[in-house]
C-alpha cells in the first residue's frame, strides 16, 4: 500500500505555510520551573487546529499542562517532563516546531516565564536595595549550547522601589543592534533571550539590577558549540511514491537540509541493454534536473513532470551533495491508463465514474 500521496501533501503544506521548522530547539529547565513553549504558525497563514506531542504521544491538557493556540505550558516541571516536544498541525501531523526539553534537578537560569516573580515583587513593602528572589535558579553560571539554539539568561529580583534591569556583554552595554537577530529583553521576567545563537555570541553576560538603594549583578558565561558538519539530510518520506493517470502532471518533492551549500540533482533510473546497473553495480541514470545559472534551491527541490506517458513510469532519485558527502532518496512513479480508456475497457471489468 503506497503512502506516497500522504507524504507528498505534507511537503506541500510546508511550502504553503512557510519555512520548515528550524533545527530542534534545545531547552533546559530546572525542577519546579514552568516549561513554556511557543510555536507561532509559519507564514502566518491559517493552519487549522494544532496539537502538542511529547515523545510521540499527544499531550492531554490538564491542570498542570496548559495548551492554547501555538503555546504549551507545563507547570511545576519534573524530570518526567523531559523529552522531545513538537507542535504539529492536527490535521496532517506536519511538524511546525521541535523542542528538546530537559528538566534537571538543579534549578536552571533558564527563562521559565512562569510569572511567579512578579507576584513576589508586589509583596515588598519596606524600602530597600534589590535582592535576588530566586538565587537557587541562578547557580548555572556557564551555559554551553549548540549553534542555532535559543538561550535565556534570567536574574529574578525584587526591591522597593522596583529595580531596573540592564545587560552587559563582556562588561559593555548590550543592545539588540549588537547582534544579528537582535535580543528580547523581558523586564517583567528579568530575562534576556537570544534566538539562533552563533559563535560570535560567546562571552560573559551580566545582568545589572539596581534601584536608588543599591545595585546587584550576576554574570553568566555563554559558550556556543559549532554545529558538526554533515552531508545533506533529506526529509523522510520525500520524494514519495506516486500514481498518476496518463497525460496528467506529477510533482516529486525533495526537502534538503544542509549547513554547507548543497548541490541537488534529479535522476531517472534507466535500462541499458536490458540492465539497470553497470558492470560495477552503479545504476544507470539520466540527469533530469540540476543546478543552472538561474535555478534556485527551492526550484530544485521540486521535479515537475508534465503530460506523463507510460515511458515516464519508473524510479526517480533526488541526489543532494555538499562538501562532506552525498545523500539520496528515491521514489517510484506508476502511470495508469487514462479515464477514457478505462471506460472503453468496460468489458474487461472497469468502470470510471465522474
Amino acid at each position: 500500500e503506497s503512502l506516497g500521496t500522504e507524504q507528498r501533501v505534507v511537503g506541500r503544506v510546508a511550502e504553503v505555510s512557510g519555512p520548515e521548522p528550524s533545527q530542534q530547539e534545545q531547552l533546559v529547565f530546572g525542577s519546579g520551573d514552568a516549561v513554556e513553549l511557543s510555536c507561532p504558525p509559519p507564514g502566518g497563514g491559517p493552519m487549522g487546529p494544532t496539537v502538542w506531542v511529547k515523545d510521540g504521544a499527544g499531550l492531554v491538557p490538564s491542570e498542570r499542562v496548559l495548551v492554547g493556540p501555538q503555546r504549551l505550558q507545563v507547570l511545576n516541571a519534573s524530570h518526567e517532563d523531559s523529552g522531545a516536544y513538537s507542535c504539529r498541525q492536527r490535521l496532517t501531523q506536519l511538524v511546525l516546531c521541535h523542542f528538546s526539553v530537559r528538566v534537571t534537578d538543579a534549578p536552571s537560569s533558564g527563562d521559565d516565564e512562569d510569572g511567579e516573580d512578579e507576584a513576589e515583587d508586589t509583596g515588598v513593602d519596606t524600602a530597600g536595595a534589590p535582592y535576588w528572589t530566586r538565587p537557587e535558579r541562578m547557580d548555572k553560571k556557564l551555559l554551553a549550547v549548540p549553534a542555532a539554539n535559543t538561550v535565556r539568561f534570567r536574574c529574578p529580583a525584587a526591591g522597593n522601589p522596583t529595580p531596573s534591569i540592564s545587560w552587559l556583554k563582556n562588561g559593555k552595554e548590550f543592545r539588540g543592534e549588537h547582534r544579528i537577530g537582535g535580543i528580547k529583553l523581558r523586564h517583567q521576567q528579568w530575562s534576556l533571550v537570544m534566538e539562533s545563537v552563533v559563535p560570535s555570541d560567546r562571552g560573559n553576560y551580566t545582568c545589572v539590577v539596581e534601584n536608588k538603594f543599591g545595585s546587584i549583578r550576576q554574570t553568566y558565561t555563554l559558550d556556543v558549540l559549532e554545529r558538526s558538519p554533515h552531508r545533506p539530510i533529506l526529509q523522510a518520506g520525500l520524494p514519495a511514491n506516486q500514481t498518476a493517470v496518463l497525460g496528467s502532471d506529477v510533482e516529486f518533492h525533495c526537502k534538503v537540509y544542509s549547513d554547507a551549500q548543497p548541490h541537488i540533482q534529479w535522476l531517472k533510473h534507466v535500462e541499458v541493454n536490458g540492465s539497470k546497473v553497470g558492470p560495477d553495480g552503479t545504476p544507470y541514470v539520466t540527469v533530469l534536473k540540476t543546478a543552472g545559472a538561474n535555478t534556485t534551491d527551492k526550484e530544485l527541490e521540486v521535479l515537475s513532470l508534465h503530460n506523463v506517458t507510460f515511458e515516464d513510469a519508473g524510479e526517480y532519485t533526488c541526489l543532494a551533495g555538499n562538501s562532506i558527502g552525498f545523500s539520496h532518496h528515491s521514489a517510484w512513479l506508476v502511470v495508469l491508463p487514462a479515464e477514457e480508456e478505462l471506460v472503453e475497457a468496460d468489458e474487461a471489468g472497469s468502470v470510471y465514474a465522474g
Epitope: 506516497g4 499527544g58 495548551v67 492554547g68
Partner: antibody, heavy 121, light 110 residues
Amino acid sequence: EVQLLESGGGLVQPGGSLRLSCAASGFTFSSYDMSWVRQAPGKGLEWVSGIYSGDGSIYYADSVKGRFTISRDNSKNTLYLQMNSLRAEDTAVYYCAKDAPTNEMSRFDYWGQGTLVTVSS
Amino acid sequence: QSVLTQPPSASGTPGQRVTISCSGSSSNIGNNYVSWYQQLPGTAPKLLIYADSKRPSGVPDRFSGSKSGTSASLAISGLRSEDEADYYCASWDYSLSGYVFGGGTKLTVL
C-alpha cells in the same frame, strides 16, 4: 468498544433552541477531538463544528457560526451542541463523530447513530 | 453546492472495478489529506479511507484511495452487492477553517 449516543433531537419552531448531547464510552474521551456532522433528509453530509483538545480550539461551519455552540464536559464524557436561532434549513440528522488520536492524521473513525432535529412551524 | 465535487452516481456490475472521483482546490485537497466514508442505507457513515490512501483495520483491500494534485479518487475492485451505498470524500479546508464533504456519490450495483 467505542460507543457514541446522541440525544436531544426533536421538533422545534423556527427561531427556537435545542441542545444536543453525545454520550461517549469505550475510550478516554478527554484525549480526543470531537465533531458534529449533520445530514439533511435526502442530502449529503455537512460538517457542523469541531472541538480540538490539542490546543483548545473550536471551529464552526459558516452556516452555523454565531448560532451554534459546541462544548464538552470531560467529567461526564459528553459532547454538546447548543443550537439557537434555528432555521428550517437546520433540519437534519445530527451525528456525533470521534476523531482519531491527536498524534495521528485527522479522520472521523467512529460515528454515533444520529439524532433527528426538525425545525418547522 | 458542495466545496468538493463528486459525481452524483456511479454504477457497476458485480466483480467490476469502479472509481469515484472527488475534485477540490489547493485550499483543501491540494494541501490536506482526504478521507472517504461509506454510508449504507439507513445507517451512520463509516470510515473507509483516510490520509488519502490508508485503510483502517477491517476495511477490505478491495477499497483503495489515491490522490493527484487537487483531485482524489476512491477505487472499489471486485464490486459486491453489499457495496451499494453512498460514498463521501472529505478534507479540511484552510480558507474556510473547517471540514468539507463532497456531495456524495450513490453507487448502484447492477
